[in-house]
């Protein structure tokens, strides 16, 4: 393409660069549905924001294709554990795409936090962090799931969160 | 704005793009003050650097407003724990802004690492990682705090650190 | 340099910006060699990709100098532990450079995951995440090491991985 085309492209790029897609969603009282669905998130209040990405029913929705660093942290805790010391937490980031009927695992962690509690009355805390670069097409969605979500502790949006930015 | 203005803006952006703000600060012997203040960091030696951000008394200081991915890891460890299994670590990234008198929680983790030491062997290790995107204005500061900081282990700057980059 | 030079530089930057270096490598059956070397990774299948970085024998090889956010997660687990509850995991990112004969520690974590198992027959899971910004020159390499690698659990590339992107 000629200089004019290149110029237009550069102008375009500068403008799009101004809104390099990024988002940070925070945990809220409504995050844990108990329905078997993904965690839900706050998108506007406090530290939460969406810039060049959208949100739908727990999912970050990609509007511009590219490589994204996606991340999530969940705060775990309890007094004892529902399944005792054998309780396992699976915390994962999953992709939904129109091209497949099922969610695709992207980044996953398994932890046994309850070994930290030596009796049913023991208070314990733990945290799980995930982050990595994945390619996402426009229209694809990313969600966070935690099994067993009864062990997730929410408070003020700083301890459990979900975000992404284009790299 | 006309082509000339756009050109200037592009040139400007290219220059600023060369110094996309980023920093990585490392733990040092002086990091733990025991004063109740934030952790202090090495800014120049070894792996530590500042690029488009400045540093003051433990804080990364923002010079250019924008969205930043901020992160911190702390290496935890000990021989037994001051409060036994009930010992809890809180590791957090906090914002200081001229607009509020108090620090604002940005990203926080709580862990009960002392359950990792059992029976006669009292030695344990654990690690806490935090990372997420936040909006920061010029002049605002981010600090790292750990409570109880007696459980933080420093050595060579690779195990406990603090950083940020604009996204 | 004059406008023409600036124009060329901008065009160049736009093109290079299109391939801002990034990579995400995933764990595979062949990752654990037991040879004392670094972990090996899948570079093409599934979620794995290389863009503006290359790969050689477990190492991400830098082709363009700059600051990179590098990261790794490893999934740990077992039934009991080889050294009992005292077992310590060291998970680290290390740099290889032609300028030094030995690897340089970049980011390191130590964990005592086996305290999560309350008896020799107890199944446990844990996870270790590392991420931080480091400066890398062209030709330098980054590898992941885990000691004791017998405690690393591989499955489908989502639980143990290694990546980087220029910031």
């Amino acid at each position: 393409d000629g200089p004019a085309g290149s110029w237009e492209q550069l102008i375009q790029e500068r403008r799009s660069h101004e809104v390099n897609p990024a988002a940070h969603l925070t945990g809220a009282n409504s995050s844990l549905t108990g329905s078997g669905g993904p965690l839900l998130w706050e998108t506007q209040l406090g530290l939460a924001f969406l810039r060049g990405l959208s949100y739908h029913d727990g999912a970050l929705v990609v509007t511009k294709a590219g490589y994204y660093y996606i991340y999530s942290k969940v705060q775990l805790g309890g007094v004892g554990c529902p399944l005792g010391l054998a309780s396992t937490i699976t915390h994962g980031l999953y992709k939904r795409t129109p091209r497949y009927p099922e969610e695709l695992e992207l980044l996953v962690s398994q932890q046994s936090p309850c070994g930290r509690a030596t009796s049913s009355s023991r208070v314990w805390w733990d945290s799980s962090f995930l982050g990595g670069v994945v390619h996402l097409e426009a229209g694809e969605e990313v969600v966070v799931r935690v099994l067993d979500e009864r062990l997730v502790r929410l408070r003020d949006g700083t301890r459990s969160y979900f975000g992404a930015f284009m790299v | 704005d006309g082509p000339a203005g756009s050109w200037e803006q592009l040139i400007q952006e290219r220059r600023s793009h060369e110094v996309n703000p980023a920093a990585h600060l490392t733990g040092a012997n002086s990091s733990l003050t025991g004063s109740g203040g934030p952790l202090l960091w090495e800014t120049q030696l070894g792996l530590a650097f500042l690029r488009g951000l400045s540093y003051h008394d433990g804080a990364l200081v923002v010079t250019k407003a924008g969205y930043y991915y901020i992160y911190s890891k702390v290496q935890l460890g000990g021989v037994g724990c001051p409060l036994g299994l009930a010992s809890t670590i809180t590791h957090g990234l906090y914002k200081r802004t001229p607009r509020y008198p108090e620090e604002l929680e940005l990203l926080v983790s709580q862990q009960s690492p002392c359950g990792r030491a059992t029976s006669s062997s009292r030695v344990w290790w654990d690690s806490s990682f935090l990372g997420g995107v936040v909006h920061l204005e010029a002049g605002e500061e981010v600090v790292v705090r750990v409570l109880d900081e007696r459980l933080v282990r420093l050595r060579d700057g690779t195990r406990s650190y603090f950083g940020a980059f604009m996204v | 340099d004059g406008p023409a030079g600036s124009w060329e530089q901008l065009i160049q930057e736009r093109r290079s910006h299109e391939v801002n270096p990034a990579a995400h490598l995933t764990g595979a059956n062949s990752s654990l060699t037991g040879s004392g070397g670094p972990l090996l990774w899948e570079t093409q299948l599934g979620l794995a990709f290389l863009r503006g970085l290359s790969y050689h024998d477990g190492a991400l090889v830098v082709t363009k100098a700059g600051y990179y956010y590098i990261y790794s997660k490893v999934q740990l687990g077992g039934v009991g532990c080889p050294l009992g509850l005292a077992s310590t995991i060291t998970h680290g990112l290390y740099k290889r450079t032609p300028r030094y004969p030995e690897e340089l520690e970049l980011l390191v974590s130590q964990q005592s995951p086996c305290g999560r198992a309350t008896s020799s027959s107890r199944v446990w899971w844990d996870s270790s995440f590392l991420g931080g910004v480091v400066h890398l020159e062209a030709g330098e390499e980054v590898v992941v090491r885990v000691l004791d690698e017998r405690l690393v659990r591989l499955r489908d590339g989502t639980r143990s991985y290694f990546g980087a992107f220029m910031v």
């Epitope: - | 460890g77 409060l83 036994g84 299994l85 009930a86 029976s119 030695v123 050595r155 | -």
Partner: antibody, heavy 119, light 111 residues
Framework: QVQLVQSGAEVKKPGASVKVSCKAS????????MNWVRKAPGQGLEWIGR????????NYNQKFMGRVTFTVDRSTSTVYMELSSLRSEDTAVYYC????????????WGQGTLVTVSS | EIVMTQSPATLSVSPGERATLSCKAS??????????MNWYQQKPGQAPRLLIY???NLESGIPARFSGSGSGTEFTLTISSLQSEDFAVYYC?????????FGQGTKVEIK
């Protein structure tokens, strides 16, 4: 100032139990571990175990397991050590020792309680 | 358990002289560059008194003539110039592993 005041001397018969108290003052009671140590005549110091006042969690020296119990009364900032199935070799001075700020040493000690086991 | 062995059993020293007490552990008491070794002084009819913690740190209120050194399995307590009030029994103690164990003690007596 930090003070640990222990209960008075006791004389017990073999097979009996003894309960020694240690009342703390001058610091935040729940912030420090309390250890128990004894010194038998002509012997050195011997660690019996520890209690964490914040939770009541205990760790005992295997040698005393099953015979010793530590308890805490947070309302009075007092810890107790009960030793059962006493034998003559349990004759000793029993001390409580506060865990230091870095918790792996004992920076303040009670005055000691002499327990004599004799038929 | 970790066995602590002190030597000598008895040390006869004149006031003003230097006293060097030794303590050996049956295995290393180090963790992350720190030694989990403490020294106590005990006088007849009194409770023990903490002198040195973590091998070389002087406890608050303890005179500077007391110093500790060593790492791994071998440790030393030094009293640079003995005063009359220093004649007592000295115990080393490890806290890296349960049960905490003490040495059998070194009695420092007047020569």
């Amino acid at each position: 100032q930090v003070q640990l005041v222990q209960s008075g001397a006791e004389v017990k018969k073999p097979g009996a139990s003894v309960k020694v108290s240690c009342k703390a003052s001058g610091y935040t009671f729940i912030d420090h571990i309390m250890n128990w140590v004894r010194k038998a005549p002509g012997q050195g110091l011997e660690w019996i175990g520890r209690i964490y006042p914040v939770s009541g969690e205990t760790n005992y020296n295997q040698k005393f397991m099953g015979r010793v119990t530590f308890t805490v009364d947070r309302s009075t900032s007092t810890v107790y050590m009960e030793l059962s199935s006493l034998r003559s070799e349990d004759t000793a001075v029993y001390y409580c020792g506060r865990g230091s700020y870095y918790w792996n040493a004992m920076d303040y000690w009670g005055q000691g309680t002499l327990v004599t086991v004799s038929s | 358990e970790i066995v602590m062995t002190q030597s000598p059993a008895t040390l006869s020293v004149s006031p003003g002289e230097r006293a060097t007490l030794s303590c050996k552990a049956s295995q290393s008491v180090d963790f992350d560059g720190e030694s989990y070794m403490n020294w106590y002084q005990q006088k007849p009819g009194q409770a023990p008194r903490l002198l040195i913690y973590s091998a070389s740190n002087l406890e608050s209120g303890i005179p500077a003539r007391f110093s500790g050194s060593g790492s791994g399995t071998e440790f030393t307590l030094t009293i640079s110039s003995l005063q009359s009030e220093d004649f007592a029994v000295y115990y080393c103690q490890q806290s890296i592993e349960d049960p905490w164990t003490f040495g059998q003690g070194t009695k420092v007596e007047i020569k």
